[in-house]
Interface confidence: medium
C-alpha cells in the first residue's frame, strides 16, 4: 500500500526502527517540537519546511480544487508547490469510495471524486 507524501511541519516523532521499517520522515521544525533530548519550545511556525523523503499518509482534506473529469482527487497544498516528477505527481492522487460520499446534503458540494474500486477515505493507491 503506497501513500502520498505528507507535507507537514511537525517533526515530533523520532524513528526507533530502521529506514526500511519506518513509514516516513516528518519534516523537521525545531521551533515546534522537542528534539530527541526533549528540549525545545512548542510554538507554531508559519513557514514549514517541506523535506519529506519517504511516503507518508495523507487523508483528503484539501482546499477546493477546480472540477475536472477525473475519478481522483488531486491534493492541493496552500504551501507553494515544489517541482514534482510525474511519479511524484501521481502519488498525490487520493482515491475515494462511493460510501464516503454518503454525507449530509449540505456537504454534497464539496469537491470529492469517487472511484468504485477504492474502499476508503484514508486508503491510498494500492
Amino acid at each position: 500500500e503506497s501513500r502520498a507524501e505528507l507535507t507537514s511541519d511537525k517533526d515530533m516523532y523520532l524513528d526507533n526502527s530502521s529506514i526500511e521499517e519506518a513509514s516516513g520522515v516528518y519534516p523537521i521544525d525545531d521551533d515546534d517540537y522537542a528534539s530527541a533530548s526533549g528540549s525545545g519550545a512548542d510554538e507554531d511556525v508559519e513557514s514549514p519546511e517541506l523535506t519529506t523523503s519517504r511516503p507518508l499518509p495523507k487523508i483528503l482534506l484539501t482546499s477546493a480544487a477546480p472540477k475536472v473529469e477525473t475519478t481522483t482527487l488531486n491534493i492541493q497544498n496552500k504551501i507553494p508547490a515544489q517541482t514534482k516528477s510525474p511519479e511524484e505527481t501521481d502519488k498525490e492522487k487520493v482515491h475515494l469510495s462511493d460510501s464516503e460520499r454518503k454525507m449530509d446534503p449540505a456537504e454534497e458540494d464539496t469537491n470529492v471524486y469517487t472511484e468504485k474500486h477504492s474502499d476508503s477515505l484514508f486508503k491510498r493507491t494500492e
Epitope: L6, M12, D44, L56, I59, L61, N77, R124
Partner: antibody, heavy 123, light 107 residues
Framework: EVQLVETGGGVVQPGRSLTLSCGAS????????MHWVRQAPGKGLEWVAV????????YYGDSVKGRFTISRENIKNTLYLQMNSLRSEDTAVYYC????????????????WGQGTMVTVSS | AIRMTQSPSSLSASVGDRVTITCRAS??????LAWFQQKPGEAPKSLII???RLKSGVPSRFSGSGSGTEFALTISSLRPEDFATYYC?????????FGGGTKVEIK
C-alpha cells in the same frame, strides 16, 4: 503552551441537541485539520469526526453520521460539534484533537488533545 | 471498518519489568498505526505514530514495531509513571478506529 479547551458539555435529554466548542490557543489553528474523539464512561476511544483546515471537508464516524455536524470558525480559533437527535449511547467525554499534519494535509492521527467535556444523555 | 484488537486487555507488572502490548488489525494497514497512553481522568497522550516513530519527549524505553496487521508496543523497563491504559489506532482507512485498550497495572 499549545492548548485545546472543550466547553459545552452537560446533561441533555434523548432526542435533544447540544453544541460543543473547542477553543485553540498558541498555534495557528487555521493550519490544521481537527478531530473530535469520544470516550464513553469506562470504555475505549471512538473517533467521531474530522474537518479540514479550512472547513471545506468533513467526515464522520458511522455511529454519528447524519446526526452530528463538525464545523469551525478559524477567525475565532474555535472548533464545534453540533450534536442532534442525541441518544443514551452518545454519553461520553468528548475530546477535540489536532491532527499531526499541517495545511491541506491530514494524517488521521492526533498530537494535541483537549481535556475533554462530559456529555450525558439521560431522561 | 477495520477492527483493532489489543491483547492483553489488562496486565499486572512490576517496576523494571519489560512489557509488550500487541495490536492486531483485521486487515493490512501498512505502518499507519499510532499508540496513545491514557491515565485516569486525563486525555490520551501521543506516544508513537507510523508504528515505530517515537514522539519527541517520550522516553526511549517506549518502542513500537510491526507492520501490516501485527503491531507491538514495548516498554523496556517499566517505571511508576507508566502504569496507565494504552490504545492503538489505525489511520490507514476511514473510519479511524482504536483498539480496545490495555490497562497496565501494578503487580
Amino acid at each position: 503552551e499549545v492548548q485545546l479547551v472543550e466547553t459545552g458539555g452537560g446533561v441533555v435529554q434523548p432526542g435533544r441537541s447540544l453544541t460543543l466548542s473547542c477553543g485553540a490557543s498558541e498555534f495557528t489553528f487555521s493550519n490544521y485539520a481537527m478531530h473530535w474523539v469520544r470516550q464513553a464512561p469506562g470504555k475505549g476511544l471512538e473517533w467521531v469526526a474530522v474537518i479540514s483546515y479550512d472547513g471545506t471537508k468533513k467526515y464522520y464516524g458511522d455511529s454519528v453520521k447524519g446526526r452530528f455536524t463538525i464545523s469551525r470558525e478559524n477567525i475565532k480559533n474555535t472548533l464545534y460539534l453540533q450534536m442532534n437527535s442525541l441518544r443514551s449511547e452518545d454519553t461520553a467525554v468528548y475530546y477535540c484533537a489536532r491532527d499531526v499534519g499541517k495545511g491541506v494535509t491530514a494524517t488521521g492521527t492526533f498530537d494535541i488533545w483537549g481535556q475533554g467535556t462530559m456529555v450525558t444523555v439521560s431522561s | 471498518a477495520i477492527r483493532m484488537t489489543q491483547s492483553p486487555s489488562s496486565l499486572s507488572a512490576s517496576v523494571g519489568d519489560r512489557v509488550t502490548i500487541t495490536c492486531r488489525a483485521s486487515q493490512g494497514i501498512g505502518s499507519y498505526l499510532a499508540w496513545f497512553q491514557q491515565k485516569p481522568g486525563e486525555a490520551p497522550k501521543s506516544l508513537i505514530i507510523d508504528a515505530t516513530r517515537l514522539k519527541s519527549g517520550v522516553p526511549s524505553r517506549f518502542s513500537g514495531s510491526g507492520s501490516g496487521t501485527e503491531f507491538a508496543l514495548t516498554i523496556s523497563s517499566l517505571r511508576p509513571e507508566d502504569f496507565a491504559t494504552y490504545y492503538c489506532q489505525q489511520y490507514n482507512v476511514s473510519p479511524l478506529t482504536f483498539g480496545g485498550g490495555t490497562k497496565v497495572e501494578i503487580k
